[in-house]
């Protein structure tokens, strides 16, 4: 706590300007009116205050707005935003995308901090859903943002927002997240023609079911191995050798290099060796000729 001391004669701040950087901690506390600070917050960012001085300025705003800062102040916080705790931010009601952008700009180049995560959470909850403009903004600042959301949170993303998603935005998504995003992407891109559709949907295919992969195999898409390796194992297993060959096109040769890794390894174990041999890649581990394959999962379902 800063002691309450009287402001020395002639030192009372008439405006927020660079002369204040020469004020000692107690002088700032005594000589800067909190209401003046609030109305001239836009100037603070242009003045090279020390961290100690920023602590004093924050303390003044906290006293003026114990229930949380108004958006007019929040929008101009600048570097002072880095001083806020998640608890401070939970008191805010941020509705303007411009305010969000201004604060994200301050944190640009740094990893997503707890403060930023709280700010985004408050903003998205206030809007009710993750609309396209918001998603555009967030992924521009944090390409991994989408993959930081839980499947439940992702369920509030409207299909129209999927157009804002770039392939790199999905790099760190796990299968559970892609399971939620894929149907939205399928809906968003449904009116595109074959090749264009595949280009757009490709990054989301880690959430695709078997029937969609079968359908893609009929469209000469030439899926690359990197995409194939990210597919759900349970979606790949029922595909026939012929379907995988059609799905991968010229990239089918890459299966050999990946034969020990999922989902290729598990898929090989489900195929007849005869069928695998037709690929001419030397893939081993298939079901030997003459063996009968029982689908136990089907039997369990019947019993």
């Amino acid at each position: 706590e800063v002691e309450k001391t009287a402001c020395p004669s002639g030192k009372k701040a008439r405006e927020i300007d660079e002369s204040l950087i020469f004020y000692k901690k107690w002088e700032l506390e005594a000589c800067v009116d909190a209401a003046l600070l609030a109305t001239q917050m836009d100037r603070v960012n242009a003045i090279p205050f020390t961290y100690e001085q920023l602590d004093v300025l924050k303390h003044k705003l906290d006293e003026l707005y114990p229930q949380g800062y108004p958006e007019s102040v929040i929008q101009h916080l600048g570097y002072l935003f880095l001083k806020m705790s998640p608890e401070d931010i939970r008191k805010w009601n941020v509705t303007s995308l411009e305010t969000l952008k201004a604060l994200l700009e301050v944190n640009k180049g740094h990893e997503m901090s707890p403060q930023v995560a709280t700010l985004i959470d408050r903003f998205v909850k206030g809007r009710g859903q993750l609309d396209k403009d918001t998603l555009d903004t967030l992924t521009a600042f944090y390409p991994g943002y989408l993959c930081s959301l839980s499947p439940e949170e992702l369920s509030s993303v409207p299909p129209s927002s999927i157009w804002a998603v770039r392939p790199q935005d999905l790099d760190t998504c796990d299968p559970r997240q892609l399971d939620v995003l894929y149907p939205k992407a399928r809906l968003a891109f449904q009116n595109m023609n074959g090749s264009e559709y595949f280009v757009k949907i490709q990054s989301f295919l880690g959430g695709a079911p078997t029937e969609d992969l079968k359908a893609l195999s009929q469209q000469n898409v030439s899926m690359d191995l990197a995409t194939f390796m990210k597919l759900r194992t349970d979606a790949v297993l029922p595909l026939t050798v012929a379907e995988v060959q059609k799905l991968l096109g010229p990239h089918v040769e890459g299966l050999k290099a990946e034969e020990r890794h999922r989902p290729v390894r598990d898929w090989i174990l489900r195929q007849r060796q005869d069928d695998l041999d037709t690929l001419g890649l030397g893939l081993q581990g298939g079901i030997p000729n003459g063996y009968l394959v029982l689908d136990l999962s089907m039997q369990e379902a019947l019993s």
């Epitope: 660079e18 950087i21 000692k24 901690k25 960012n45 242009a46 090279p48 205050f49 020390t50 961290y51 100690e52 001085q53 600048g78 570097y79």
Partner: antibody
């Protein structure tokens, strides 16, 4: 690429004013504050002062009156107003690590320029 | 008057070993402390800022910790190239903008 380079260091007699110049490239002095740090032979680092993007100067308490920092669009000068033998040191120019701050860490340093004060 | 005190100096350890350098501030500076490495004839090189954040391109063998008045720099898996003098610097307030006295690290 971004760089800073000091020049002007030489042998001077006590009381003869000397101005050192720091020339920057690859970034703008309107975006970053710049500081001067010195190091006497075999001794540690000593912060002298810093100049803000807006041209405001701030000095270590021991350096007030002994040094003057000023700048142009691409250079930052350090004037040693009346050198004494205690001012013999390598003088480094360094960029403050983030725009918007006057007091911060330094993330870009010059190689330094040697000033020798002797009669 | 604000002071940053570094201990010990010099400190020595064998290749592959670990050294810990301490920096003590005479006032609370929160986490606003940086660490630098300086080799003879070269300018200082930023290693760590805000007490624990590794600067770009710096090996993860360097680890900073602490807040308030007590800070440490730990160098693990020592290499010959780590032989240098290490400085801490505070930048919380105008009155506490200063460097520590330096700690020489000798690698045997």
């Amino acid at each position: 690429s971004q760089s800073v380079e000091e020049s002007g260091g030489r042998l001077v007699t006590p009381g003869t004013p000397l101005t050192l110049t720091c020339t920057v490239s690859g970034f703008s002095l309107s975006s970053y504050a710049m500081g001067w740090v010195r190091q006497a032979p075999g001794e540690g680092l000593e912060w002298i002062g810093t100049i803000s993007t807006g041209g405001i100067t701030y000095y270590a308490s021991w350096a007030k009156g002994r040094f003057t920092i000023s700048k142009t669009s691409t250079t930052v000068d350090l004037k040693i107003t009346s050198p004494t033998t205690e001012d013999t040191a390598t003088y480094f120019c360094a960029r403050v690590g983030s725009s918007g701050y006057l007091f911060y860490f330094f993330n870009l340093w010059g190689q330094g320029t040697l000033v020798t004060v002797s009669s | 008057v604000f002071e940053l005190t570094q201990t010990p100096s010099p400190v020595s350890a064998a290749v592959g070993g670990t050294v810990t350098i301490r920096c003590q501030a005479s006032q609370n500076i929160k986490s606003y402390l940086a660490w630098y490495q300086q080799k003879p004839g070269q300018p200082p090189k930023l290693l760590i800022y805000e007490a624990s954040i590794l600067a770009s391109g710096v090996s993860s063998r360097f680890k900073g910790s602490g807040s308030g008045t007590e800070f440490t720099l730990t160098i693990s898996d020592l290499e010959c190239a780590d032989a240098a003098t290490y400085y801490c610097q505070s930048y919380y307030a105008a009155s506490s903008n200063a460097f520590g006295g330096g700690t020489e690290v000798v690698v045997k």
